[in-house]
């Protein structure tokens, strides 16, 4: 049966406390990504920034998860839901930052 | 192997210019998105710029906005970055990324020194 969005959305935080708890080498080696609007369509603008990076085991579970809440198909190099490209960030910076909205989220108990 | 090399570093004064240049090989140069990151003494790294594959999107860090031009020529697999009126601030390594690659695979950098 289909994960309820409530748990789906707590597996994910709880991914990217894992990934910033772990984290001793810089993640993804310092690789930089394009940075968000986190206000609209959080799930398909992170997973199409973040996307882009290959060879990254540490963010691979995220990217499928990210990928199972946004409704569209997401491929690498599709900017659809970025809107604006104005900043890059490490990739490190990136999982913080989506971690503090995640959670925000979740305690208002917008889950999808 | 992707292999980056970056020249066209020094020591410049406050007001002046810079044309930093990186040679790309071991990839396919015209179909990546590139980038210049930068890294001042004892602080972390900043994106400076990115050119899409096809020269149609360029995009600048607010710091740099106006002062620096990114460019390509994808027939001499290289990417340059002009830089004009930079200010003690932009004192920096410089390094050249095939974007969304981690830094073992950029290059050595170009040390940039702005002084008087």
């Known amino acids: 049966s289909p994960v309820p969005p409530s748990t789906a959305l707590k597996e994910l935080i709880e991914e990217l406390v894992n990934i910033t708890q772990n984290q001793k080498a810089p993640l993804c080696n310092g690789s930089m990504v394009w940075s968000i609007n986190l206000t609209a369509g959080v799930y398909c603008a992170a997973l199409e920034s973040l996307i882009n990076v290959s060879g990254c085991s540490a963010i691979e579970k995220t990217q499928r998860m990210l990928n199972g809440f946004c409704p569209h198909k997401v491929s690498a190099g599709q900017f659809s839901s970025l809107r604006v490209r104005d900043t890059k960030i490490e990739v490190a910076q990136f999982v913080k930052d989506l971690l503090v909205h995640l959670k925000k989220l979740f305690r208002e108990g917008q889950f999808n | 192997e992707v292999q980056l090399l970056e020249s066209g570093g020094g020591l410049v004064q406050p007001g002046g210019s810079l044309r930093l240049s990186c040679v790309a090989s071991?990839?396919?140069?015209?179909?990546?998105?590139m980038d210049w990151v930068r890294q001042a003494p004892g602080k972390g790294l900043e994106w400076v710029s990115t050119i899409s594959p096809s020269r149609r999107g360029t995009y600048y860090a607010d710091s740099v906005k106006g002062r620096f031009t990114i460019s390509r020529d994808n027939s001499k697999n290289t990417l340059y970055l002009q830089m004009n009126s930079l200010r003690a601030e932009d004192t920096a390594v410089y390094y050249c990324?095939?974007?969304?690659?981690?830094?073992?695979?950029w290059g050595p950098g170009t040390l940039v020194t702005v002084s008087s």
């Open positions: 071991g990839f396919t140069f015209d179909v990546a998105e």
């Open positions: 990324a095939k974007a969304y690659t981690g830094r073992s695979l």
